[in-house]
């Protein structure tokens, strides 16, 4: 039975040209956490953290994607195009697959405002 | 049934390199991640790197850094594994070994290679 | 990284025997941990992971336990065909590490 929650950024926004940290957080499980996927809004993979074998980010981004902090994901350099959703995927045994979503909108504006309050979706 | 076949034994130089490699025979690399052990004579086990070959990343052990780089052909579906530098202290058995990704990632390394046979003499 | 250190290095037994294996990590590994047996000039085959789950085709007599920083890998009766070494490996952590082994011979 999946007793566990993800809790994530929600609804966040950056200043082009800036950083923004992505971040989801699995609670009320005792479940391992085997590996976390991050996926963009078309669904194709940023990066993977495995237990065992470390961070792994896809070569296209390995130059605006840093891992962490912990199982979060730092997107660098942004860029309009980086406006979108994310999903941050946990695979865990025995429960089986969460998934959090995060809506990321990169603003033109120098005073955008950089919200982060966790919010479960 | 998916095996992994690796490349026949070695004997090398000190100072040499040696490239192993180890083909996937029946399946594809696709949702898995290949491990490199290596075990010397009368020895445990020991872990040496990791490619995740959707990706082509690969991450190593402190102790092999700089000296060994792993690499993958998805479209052939092999694995290799190249030591450089290399010194007595080398000789050993190498293996490749499967990895599940996501889903399955609670797996340990599942599949095995045969094992290639390194030996450094001069 | 990670040590592991298993206990004893290596046993005697006779079929039917009741053998217990056991595996300490220099920290807490949760059930982030596998056990491998190993026959002389063969690979590894994984037996357990997740500190206690059986792998497909692995015989029942085979059970693993524990958590955090204490594991067991227990045979409940000895088989000719189990006499091997066994390795312990955690998992928690980049980059694995395994035990230095226990080799289970004939008594």
């Known amino acids: 039975m999946m007793t566990g929650t993800i809790e994530t950024t929600g609804n966040i926004s950056a200043k082009k040209g800036g950083s923004v940290i992505l971040q989801c957080h699995l609670s009320s499980t005792m479940a391992q956490v085997t590996q976390v996927n991050w996926e963009q809004h078309d669904h194709s993979l940023l990066a993977i953290r495995n237990a065992e074998l470390g961070w792994h980010i896809y070569p296209a981004f390995k130059d605006r994607v840093a891992p962490g902090p912990g199982l979060g994901l730092t997107l660098q350099s942004l860029t309009m195009n980086d406006t979108g959703e994310y999903f941050c995927t946990y695979h865990t045994y025995p429960d089986g697959t969460y998934r959090g979503r995060i809506f990321l909108e990169v603003l033109e504006s120098s005073v955008a405002e950089h919200s982060a309050r966790f919010q479960i979706p | 049934q998916v095996q992994l076949v690796q490349s026949g034994a070695e004997v090398k130089k000190p100072g040499s390199s040696v490239k192993v490699s180890c083909k996937a025979s029946g399946g594809t690399f696709q949702n898995y991640a290949i491990s490199w052990v290596r075990q010397a004579p009368g020895q445990g086990l020991e872990w040496m790197g990791v490619i995740v070959p959707i990706f082509g990343t690969a991450n190593y052990a402190q102790k092999f850094q700089g000296r060994v780089t792993v690499t993958a052909d998805e479209s052939t579906s092999t694995a290799y594994m190249e030591l450089s530098s290399l010194r007595s202290e080398d000789t050993a058995v190498y293996y490749c070994?499967?990895?599940?990704?996501?889903?399955?990632?609670?797996?340990?390394?599942?599949?095995w290679g045969q094992g290639t046979t390194v030996t450094v003499s001069s | 990284d990670i040590q592991m250190t298993q206990s004893p290095s290596s046993l005697s037994a006779s079929v039917g025997d009741r053998v217990t294996i056991t595996c300490r990590a220099s920290?807490?590994?949760?059930?982030?941990l596998n056990w491998y047996q190993q026959k002389p000039g063969k690979a590894p085959k994984l037996l357990i992971y997740?500190?206690?789950s059986l792998q497909s085709g692995v015989p029942s007599r085979f059970s693993g336990s524990g958590s955090g920083t204490d594991f067991t890998l227990t045979i409940s009766s000895l088989q000719p065909e189990d006499f091997a070494t066994y390795y312990c490996?955690?998992?928690?952590?980049?980059?694995?590490?395994f035990g230095g082994g226990t080799k289970v011979e004939i008594k």
């Open positions: 070994a499967r990895l599940h990704l996501g889903q399955k990632a609670y797996y340990g390394m599942d599949v």
């Open positions: 997740a500190a206690s």
């Open positions: 490996q955690q998992r928690y952590v980049f980059p694995p590490t």
């Open positions: 920290q807490s590994i949760s059930s982030y």
